[in-house]
């Protein structure tokens, strides 16, 4: 949602957390800023402070329950605004009816860990995190290894189309050491993107076996 | 019915202090703001500043800092505004005025009767 | 502080007959949030003020339709189309865009 030349974007990451940013240029400066969440059909609304992460912009997290607990659903509708303090009043800077199914970021994959390890291939595993049960098997991941003398940037892209919490690395280098890198993102939502990286998992492929004299 | 009543005129020397009341009745008072506003003799409007009853924060313009002090008392639902160091200048009429707690439309809409304030030697 | 300048100080006119108070603004006074926060306020012989206007055109409940504003940016309008007796007093406008809140001057308005 944009108002005047500010620029208020949300996701909600499918359990009990609405991620707000808010950037507005020439922003007023030493002045408190909140999000407040009204639920079109809930008893409860929330409210977050917002915090700077850059010179004209501000986060926070709504959260909404215990980070497990399945808040809202497909049918909701969440008023969520930006309320900013001027003199002893509050004055809303922005506003948006978040359709939180729209508008969803799961959160960063976790417990990444090497399954099996050999000379040129690896086995990965991961679990999802906080995810919708809503999503039964409706999830898509993005892959990526980070190969000695190169960026994250210029690692290649693995897709896989399905709920799949592994993957089988091939044509490896041995004794080399490499960092592996998923994401998640349901399949539902106008507006949903890539959950953030997952941190990184270092390993190292086995040293090839030495030849016989 | 919305209502603010304000106490009535006062006559100070100057250097001394003058405290007005505003009561208000019709609504809840700690849902809404308590602007300030003065109108010095055949002179305009002057915004001095305001406060929450909810939480008793304040805002004062600079103009008045130092000077002056808004408090209020919700077991009565009244407002007050003490001004200091008082000088002939002061003399004026002070208005209380209502206004919603999240400025979306307007600032003030319904105002108290007025409290003439004189200074005088 | 943003300035609030209204012209003329004192308009008389005829009962019937349209009047028109104009008031410009030191800074612009569209705020960060996109609204533009410029009221109107009367204040009739012997009374308190009044709220008329506010956000620039929208009249406030029980204010005839007489009455209306208009302008942008540093210079607003406000008009009367046809002035009763009771329109007499004197007008202010207000930004309560920019803290510290400012008014106008005032502009008496008085039948001739």
């Known amino acids: 949602a944009v108002n005047g030349t500010s620029r208020f974007t949300c996701f909600y990451n499918s359990r009990a957390n609405i991620s707000c940013v808010w950037s507005q240029d020439g922003a007023l400066q030493d002045t408190s800023c909140q999000v407040h969440a009204w639920p079109d059909r809930r008893r409860w609304n929330q409210t977050c402070e917002l915090l700077p992460v850059s010179q004209a912009s501000w986060a926070c997290n709504l959260i909404l329950g215990t980070p497990d607990s399945q808040k809202l659903t497909a049918v909701d509708i969440v008023t969520l605004r930006v309320m900013c303090r001027e003199g002893v009043r509050w004055r809303m800077m922005a506003i948006q009816d978040f359709k939180p199914f729209e508008n969803l970021r799961l959160m960063a994959p976790i417990s990444l860990q090497v399954v099996h390890v050999e000379t040129h291939r690896c086995n990965i595993s991961w679990k999802i995190s906080q995810a919708s049960h809503y999503f039964e098997r409706h999830l898509e991941f993005e892959a990526r290894t980070l190969s000695p003398g190169h960026t994250w940037e210029e690692a290649p892209l693995m897709t896989l189309k399905q709920k799949q919490e592994w993957i089988c690395l091939e044509t490896l280098t041995p004794d080399t050491q490499y960092e592996f890198q998923v994401r998640v993102k349901p399949l539902q939502g106008e507006f949903t993107t890539w959950s953030p990286w997952s941190q990184p998992l270092a390993f190292r492929t086995k040293p090839a076996a030495l030849g016989k004299d | 019915e919305v209502q603010l009543v304000q106490s009535g005129a006062e006559v100070k020397k100057p250097g001394a202090s003058v405290k007005v009341s505003c009561k208000a009745s019709?609504?809840?008072?700690?849902?809404?703001?308590i602007s300030w506003v003065r109108q010095a003799t055949g002179q305009g409007l002057e915004w001095m500043g305001e406060?929450?009853?909810?939480?008793?924060?304040?805002y004062y313009n600079e103009m008045f800092k130092g000077r002056v002090t808004m408090t209020r008392d919700t077991s009565i639902s009244t407002a007050y505004m003490e001004l200091s160091s008082l000088r002939s200048e002061d003399t004026a009429v002070y208005y209380c005025?209502?206004?919603?707690?999240?400025?979306?439309?307007?600032?003030?809409?319904?105002w108290g009767q007025g409290t003439t304030v004189t200074v005088s030697s | 502080d943003v300035v609030m300048t209204q012209t003329p100080l004192s308009l008389p006119v005829t009962l019937g007959q349209p009047a028109s108070i104009s008031c410009r603004s030191s800074?612009?006074?569209?705020?960060?949030?996109?609204?533009?926060?410029l009221e109107w306020y009367q204040q009739r012989p012997g009374q308190s003020p009044r709220l008329l206007i506010y956000?620039?055109?929208n009249r406030f409940s029980g204010v005839p339709d007489r009455f209306s504003g208009s302008g942008s940016g540093t210079d607003f309008t406000l008009k009367i189309s046809r002035v009763e007796a009771e329109d007499v007093g004197v007008y202010y406008c207000f930004q309560g865009s920019h803290i510290p809140w400012t008014f106008g001057g005032g502009t008496k308005v008085e039948i001739k």
């Open positions: 800074q612009n006074i569209v705020h960060s949030n996109g609204n533009t926060y």
């Open positions: 019709g609504y809840t008072f700690t849902d809404y703001v």
């Open positions: 005025a209502r206004g919603s707690y999240t400025y979306d439309n307007y600032a003030m809409d319904f």
């Open positions: 956000k620039v055109s």
């Open positions: 406060i929450y009853p909810g939480d008793g924060n304040t």
